[in-house]
Interface confidence: low
């Protein structure tokens, strides 16, 4: 056949869904690849074909449209399985073509199967809450377009594997989930199991995500530098080794670019000649506050090095900070058998 | 009310030497902010001059052209910010400001300007 | 050193216009860029940073966007006292920069 413009597996879009659940995947050339969308792709006479590789094989093959209760059917530009079967997981391929232009992209589909406490290997959205800083919600995730909105599901809310109720901080609102005040007691996993009817069937759709409590904007503060501090001097005598740690402490901060960096001279140390090397060590409190440790290191350190300005610099969202550390050369200690004895007046 | 007074611009001769001030009232220049000076010649766009980081009085840095001409300091004492200025030239004829941020060139605090003149 | 481009130099419109002033950085900066307004015989007044931060104060019709090397303010509806000139700062988190601001956008009455 004539040339298609094929862009490959997208492995970008590695799409779970669990097994037994209906599906809606929308061909992904409308959403990430084509500057027009299905509507006008349709419109200009361009056909949507879809075909899919079975897991472990390597023949592409039509996808059946004839099986029982329409379980797997297409709509405009989207693949509906009602509901999905284990052995549905395989790349799946959507190409739109007419006699003149053709494009396709596929990628993989995974149906997971999850345990009655709703734990699979499906890869989970984490939601981030701020700790005591008022009511904050979760909406219950990739549910628009299985019902019409005259249809109205029922939404049961689970922590872990228990059903919420009765929680003294979280209620359940429906497609929502309040948190009164997120406190790090509430860091879990998070299910809402959605219930609506379909032609006289019943569906279940099941989505969880990960709640994480972080540090409040309210308690953000600029960097604070730990280290380097007026209290400690670093005196060597040329030919020791300099080890001079640059500690910085971040508030959590969403979305915060945090960064920690040297400058020796006012030049960042790739830029001058010295042999200098920097290791950097990240950790975290519980709630995302982090704290970076970048030790700056001379291995045989000069005179000359030691008359250098060391500076750590810290950077984040709130504001950027900067401290010298105090470098000096040690006084070598007098040897006391000349310059003491000398001072006695020994002879 | 927060502000910055600037002071000390004027006329001098090429080569010679000028002391800018920049006062601060209603908040300490001690506290750990970045204290810039920014310059802008007559009709001509914004360019920047020199920072000192106050929260640690030795941390200052210099635009490649200042070349050791200029120094910044400051007297926490006196709540101010300097630009020691020598071997002044003709190009150095501009609108001098004194800014202050909390990151280095967010500068959310400005003072007035003073003009600095550099002829025979 | 870093080199901020900034398109248009000047540009005229009208009360009521979307205005986009663009600013290119010639590395890699982050979001580390600032917008600046200045009116004649006046200091420069902070608008935003962080690229997309409203400063405390400025109306909501100033945004600002992008990130890396690309970079724009927006304002989405022109008031009269917005004629004026924007400087985008390039805020080169090493600082060894030089020149970080950008060359000016004068936005004057059509």
């Known amino acids: 056949s004539e040339r298609c413009d094929d862009w490959g597996l997208d492995t970008m879009r590695q799409i779970q869904v669990f097994e037994d659940e209906p599906a809606r995947i929308k061909c992904p050339l409308f959403e990430h690849f084509l500057k027009f969308n299905y509507s006008t792709a349709h419109s200009a006479g361009l056909t949507l074909i879809w075909y899919w590789t079975r897991q472990d094989r390597d023949l592409e093959e039509p996808i059946n449209f004839r099986l029982p209760e329409n379980r797997i059917s297409k709509e405009k530009d989207v693949l509906w399985f009602r509901p999905t079967l284990l052995n549905d997981t395989g790349n799946y391929t959507c190409m739109l073509r007419n006699t003149t232009y053709c494009s396709k992209v596929a990628f993989p589909l995974e149906v997971v199967q999850k345990d009655s406490c709703f734990n699979s290997p499906m890869k989970l959205p984490v939601h981030k809450l701020y700790i005591e800083y008022g009511i904050q919600r979760i909406t219950c995730p990739n549910v628009d377009g299985y019902f019409p909105s005259s249809v109205k599901p029922t939404i049961t809310w689970y922590m872990g594997c228990y059903k919420i109720q009765n929680f003294n901080n979280v209620i359940p609102e429906g497609m929502n989930l309040s948190f009164l005040i997120a406190l790090i007691s509430n860091n879990g996993n998070y299910t809402c199991v959605v219930t609506y009817p379909e032609n006289g069937r019943t569906f279940h759709l099941t989505r969880t995500l990960t709640v994480k409590v972080v540090g409040s904007p309210k308690n953000a503060v600029p960097p604070v530098i730990h280290s380097p501090n007026d209290h400690v001097v670093y005196e060597k005598e040329p030919g020791e080794e300099l080890l001079i740690p640059c500690t910085v402490y971040f508030s959590f901060l969403m979305d915060s670019r945090n960064e920690v960096w040297w400058t020796i001279d006012g030049k960042k140390p790739d830029d001058i000649t010295i042999d200098v090397t920097i290791n950097e060590s990240i950790s975290h409190s519980r709630t995302e506050d982090e704290t970076r440790t970048q030790i700056l290191s001379i291995k045989k350190v000069t005179s000359e090095d030691l008359k250098r300005s060391y500076v750590c610099h810290a950077r984040s969202a709130k504001g950027e900070v900067a401290k010298a550390a105090k470098v000096k050369q040690k006084v070598p200690a007098p040897r006391y058998t000349v310059e003491l004895a000398c001072g006695f007046g020994a002879t | 009310e927060v502000q910055l007074e600037q002071s000390g611009g004027g006329l001098v001769q090429p080569g010679g030497s000028l002391r800018l001030s920049c006062a601060a009232s209603g908040f300490s220049l001690s506290t750990s902010y970045w204290r810039c000076w920014v310059r802008q010649a007559p009709g001509k766009g914004l360019e920047w001059v020199s920072c000192?980081?106050?929260?640690?009085?030795?941390?200052?840095y210099y635009a490649n052209w200042v070349n050791g001409r200029f120094t910044i300091s400051r007297d926490n004492s006196k709540n101010t910010l300097y630009l020691q200025m020598n071997s002044l030239r003709a190009e150095d004829t501009a609108v001098y400001y004194c800014?202050?941020?909390?990151?280095?060139?967010?500068?959310?605090?400005w003072g007035q300007g003073t003009l600095v003149t550099v002829s025979s | 050193d870093i080199v901020m481009t900034q398109s248009p130099s000047s540009l005229s419109a009208s009360v009521g216009d979307r205005v986009t002033i663009t600013c290119q950085a010639s590395e890699d900066i982050y979001s580390n860029l600032a917008w600046f307004q200045q009116k004649p015989g006046q200091a420069p007044k902070l608008l935003i940073y962080d690229a997309s931060t409203l400063a405390s104060g400025v109306p909501s019709r100033f945004s600002g966007s992008g990130s890396g090397t690309e970079f724009t303010l927006t304002i989405s509806s022109l008031q009269p006292e917005d004629f004026a000139t924007y400087y985008c700062l390039g805020v080169y988190t090493h600082i060894s920069a030089d020149n970080a601001f950008g060359g000016g956008t004068k936005v004057v009455i059509k």
């Open positions: 800014a202050s941020g909390v990151g280095f060139g967010y500068f959310n605090l």
């Open positions: 000192i980081y106050a929260g640690s009085g030795d941390v200052t």
